[in-house]
């Protein structure tokens, strides 16, 4: 059968038909229902709501909608023994001691199970000591502070502000530097927008509100007692001590009032230069320890949460394709939130909800996608993208054959300037063409496309005319899919403007103020916003699963790999006396990119040509594209992170949420300098070098004609 | 080994501006705090800012606020500090010193401002 | 801005004998001092941070204390290559700022 043959509206009117259906008023409803009270993962609230949206989703028309729950490590705070951090003086008295909840805000005072704000696996204990305060946390910071301003982490507690990177790296770093604990909070500097004002009255974090978060370093293994495999009924888990990726020190967030009564008193160094510097009216000495009268005074953290094997639930609905029934594309996002979810995940969820309801339409009317659709809704993202990982890790082996793309879909807007999309290069022309036949929801952009605004406000940093697309990183549900199974993978969200807001993510994000009206007063009123992501996130999957040839270009992959090749080889080249004295030398990875080229744009010319009523030859072709970005797997994943295992992209190692280009070579190459055995380092890069040039090599083949 | 190269001697008029190079060697240029300072004939040391040669950010003695910029490029690993609207009294040896603790020193550039 | 004043202006020793210099900060700095040496037509050296750390390299004649408000430099048995000016600084807080040497002579 050909596309056509399975419906019965032309391949235009199909699209067309399925975006006029999405409604932002539907998308308004929907975030209300789903925010009026706390979904945390592993809760009774959270089973209800996945067992409503399948209720609803198989309303919605689709062919099928099932739960797949999983026994999962999770974490919570102890009920009755609260966690907190005090002042001590030198009798061992309580002098000062932060807060044990967030003012609920208004309208929401009764609402119960607010669930305080912890940092998710934090192990128990009660460490006491000097503070060091150590900025972000990040790696160049604890290298300013080691080699440069010669602190001593070893034994202390550091006080770090969220921002820059994800949580889990900063608490890594503290381990390493030696700390016994680390608090986190949020600096006005980071989560204040000027000349806005604090929830409720605007959109910026209040004083007492607090960033929750999980602070595991997962490398993307999932389940912490269960890594590479299922968290089902009969697994064997792990001892706690054999987990993946917990934390061994005691960690707490706090917000800006209670950082106030701790970095006020701070003494030692001055702060190296203005970078190290936020907002607040204290001087940001680094320590370690407090000033003069105070030099006696000590921080004490109280920390008592538990980690508990917990059941989840995913909700994973199923559109049958007429044509290829064997071919996945997947739209997921995550339902669980630490309290209400106002924007992360609901403002995604919602969006979700009118997609599913949109093809139902379709599907009820007679039509059916060319491939199947499969739709999600993950539980525990928050507690380190768990319920997604163990679905595939469950059904790796029909992923790794049949999936074409995933689709994330967690938080539709973390601002409304313009529109923000990262994903494989594969998809770029994709949402190029996609947002150039969608209206821009934009104010002074009436009657333009999505394109123009997007491209005016966030344009490309290399091509002109053009907007700027982002690597994938990680911190998201699109993980596995991508890092680990090499499935083409996207996601796309409202965002900020960069430029004039520096503050990390959005202010009241992961605290107790993310509520429907934080959305509805503030962000997006009418919907636009979210209206034009889900006809983003929506036509994306639309055309992925009803185009006949694959909307894939794989010249768009040949132009990244020269640039990331290009970048590689300028970082190795800030020592060149090493890649003489060692024979580095890059040309077997710029070969592999020149035959990459070469090849992809001999397969975009069969491409063009081919004859697309021969379903034979159709689907060999769309298999090429399909497993191309399989092919950048390397089944031994990346040095020490086995789950890592696409050779072009990575979380960065020093920040999940950012994705870095070769990161083997990358990493091998980062501070190379202070490598105790430089000839070993420069072996390391060496075999980096000729992972990634076979990999690109390889992956060109599989474009090659197949006979 | 850990090297700063000063550019050479100036004389300047009043009112003009002077910019002063610091080339560094023998370490990770991006890794120490860059920091200047100045040195009267006979007197003692007086701090004028630093920088973080990672990501530009600066600190300044309020003494110059206005006056002085420092800044860096990582491409040459080298730092720049340019002091403007000269007087007789900013007649001076000026360092840079890298790390925080001011570990390596330049060997000075001398700033005679003279009418 | 803190002040750092340093006593006495010079102090002339004896080849082998015990040289003491003193420093004041006009508020507590805790342990944020530095000591810096500058031979005659030279750049200034550093030679102890953290109040008592000495740099790498510099000899363990060299001995830093101290801490709040008062710092010592003690060379405890000076050699004639130690005839220098010795500076204190404190980096406890903004502006850091200097003292204005101790002119160490040979008696």
């Known amino acids: 059968k050909s596309s056509n043959e399975a419906t019965n509206i032309t391949p235009k009117h199909n699209m067309k038909a399925f975006l006029d259906e999405l409604k932002a008023e539907n998308i308004k409803k929907f975030l209300y229902n789903f925010t009026q009270i706390p979904h945390l993962a592993g809760t009774e609230q959270n089973f209800q709501l996945a067992k409503q949206i399948q209720s609803q989703w198989k309303e919605f028309g689709l062919d099928s909608v099932e739960l797949a729950h999983y026994d999962v490590l999770l974490s919570y705070p102890n009920k009755t023994h609260p966690n907190y951090i005090s002042i001590i003086n030198e009798d061992g008295n309580e002098i000062f001691n932060t807060s044990l909840f967030e003012p609920p805000p208004p309208g929401y005072e009764n609402v119960s199970d607010i669930v305080p704000p912890f940092s998710a696996f934090s192990p128990q204990g009660m460490p006491e000591g000097d503070l060091v305060y150590v900025n972000y946390a990040r790696t160049e910071d604890f290298f300013k502070l080691e080699r440069d301003m010669k602190i001593n982490c070893s034994g202390k507690i550091v006080i770090a502000r969220y921002g820059k990177v994800f949580r889990g790296n900063k608490v890594k770093n503290a381990q390493l530097a030696g700390a016994k604990g680390v608090i986190l909070y949020s600096d006005p500097a980071d989560y204040f927008a000027p000349g806005v004002k604090s929830y409720p009255d605007g959109w910026n974090l209040p004083g007492g509100g607090v960033q929750r978060g999980n602070i595991l370093n997962l490398n993307g293994a999932g389940d912490p007692l269960t890594p590479g495999y299922p968290a089902n009924e009969y697994a064997y888990r792990r001892g706690i001590a054999e987990a993946v990726g917990l934390p061994s020190i005691p960690v707490h967030p706090i917000g800006y009032y209670d950082a106030q009564k701790l970095l006020e008193k701070m003494g030692g160094s001055a702060p190296p230069d203005s970078s190290w510097r936020g907002s607040l009216k204290v001087p940001y000495n680094v320590g370690p320890g407090f000033t003069g009268n105070f030099s006696t005074q000590k921080v004490k953290m109280h920390i008592h949460s538990t980690n508990e094997v917990t059941r989840i639930y995913n909700v994973i609905g199923t559109l049958r394709g007429a044509v290829e029934p064997d071919r996945y594309v997947i739209l997921g996002g995550h339902r669980d939130s630490w309290v209400f979810g106002g924007i992360d995940p609901q403002s995604g969820a919602a969006v979700v909800h009118e997609i599913v309801r949109s093809f139902g339409t379709l599907k009820k009317e007679g039509w059916r996608p060319r491939r199947t659709i499969l739709f999600a809704s993950w539980d525990a993202e928050e507690f380190g993208l768990l319920g997604s990982t163990e679905w595939a890790e469950e059904n790796s082996r029909l992923l790794q054959e049949r999936g074409v793309a995933y689709i994330n879909a967690d938080s539709s807007i973390e601002g409304n300037y313009t529109l923000r999309v990262d994903c494989t290069p594969l998809m770029y022309s994709l949402v190029h063409n996609l947002t150039k036949e969608l209206k821009s929801p934009d104010e002074g952009f009436e009657g333009k496309s999505l394109y123009e605004s997007w491209t005016k406000k966030s344009p490309s940093p290399e091509f002109s005319g053009m907007p700027r697309i982002s690597k994938l990183g990680s911190g998201n549900d699109f993980e596995v899919f991508f890092q680990r199974l090499g499935i083409a993978s996207g996601r796309a969200r409202y965002t900020k403007n960069w430029e004039t807001n520096k503050f990390s993510g959005y202010p009241l994000y992961h605290s107790v103020y993310e509520t429907y009206e934080l959305v509805e007063k503030f962000y997006d009123p009418m919907f636009k916003y979210h209206l034009t992501v889900a006809q983003v996130r929506g036509g994306m999957v639309f055309e992925l699963a009803n185009s006949i040839v694959l909307p894939f270009d794989c010249r768009d992959y040949a132009v990244v790999l020269r640039k990331y090749a290009d970048k590689i080889y300028s970082i190795s080249m800030k020592h060149p006396q090493e890649m003489k004295t060692y024979s580095v030398s890059f040309d077997s990875l710029f070969s592999a990119v020149k035959n990459f080229t070469e090849i992809a744009s001999k397969f975009s010319e069969r491409l063009q040509d081919f004859d697309k009523s021969n379903p034979i030859v159709l689907r060999m072709m769309n298999d090429q594209l399909m497993f191309l970005e399989r092919a950048f797997i390397d089944p031994l994943g990346l040095p020490d992170r086995p789950f890592y295992r696409h050779v072009i992209y990575a979380p960065s190692s020093h920040n999940k949420y950012a994705g870095e280009s070769f990161p083997g070579i990358y990493d091998a190459l980062f501070d190379i300098e202070s490598k105790v055995d430089p000839s070993k380092a420069w072996g390391e890069v060496k075999r980096q070098i000729y992972v990634a040039a076979f990999t690109v090599q390889a992956a060109a083949e599989t474009l090659s004609e197949v006979a | 080994e850990v090297q700063l190269v000063q550019s050479g001697a100036e004389v300047k008029k009043p009112g003009a501006s002077v910019k002063v190079s610091c080339k560094t060697s023998g370490y990770t240029f991006t890794e120490y705090t860059i920091h200047w300072v100045r040195q009267a004939p006979g007197q003692s040391l007086e701090w004028m800012g630093n920088i973080n040669p990672n990501n530009g950010g600066t600190t300044y003695n309020q003494k110059f606020q206005g006056r002085v910029t420092i800044t860096v490029d990582k491409s040459t690993s080298t730092a720049y500090m340019e002091l403007s609207s000269l007087r007789s009294e900013d007649t001076a040896v000026y360092y840079c010193?890298?790390?925080?603790?001011?570990?390596?020193w330049g060997q000075g550039t001398l700033v005679t401002v003279s009418s | 801005d803190i002040v750092m004043t340093q006593s006495p202006d010079s102090l002339a020793v004896s080849l082998g004998e015990r040289a003491t210099l003193s420093c004041r900060a006009s508020?507590?700095?805790?342990?944020?001092v530095a000591w810096y040496q500058q031979k005659p037509d030279q750049s200034p050296k550093l030679l102890i941070y953290w109040a008592s750390t000495r740099h790498t390299g510099v000899p363990d004649r060299f001995t830093g204390s101290g801490s709040g408000t008062d710092f010592t430099l003690t060379i405890s048995s000076l050699q004639a290559e130690d005839v220098a000016v010795y500076f204190c600084q404190q980096y406890n807080s903004y502006p850091l700022t200097f003292g204005a040497g101790t002119k160490v002579e040979i008696k």
């Open positions: 508020q507590d700095v805790g342990t944020a």
């Open positions: 010193a890298a790390g925080w603790n001011f570990d390596y």
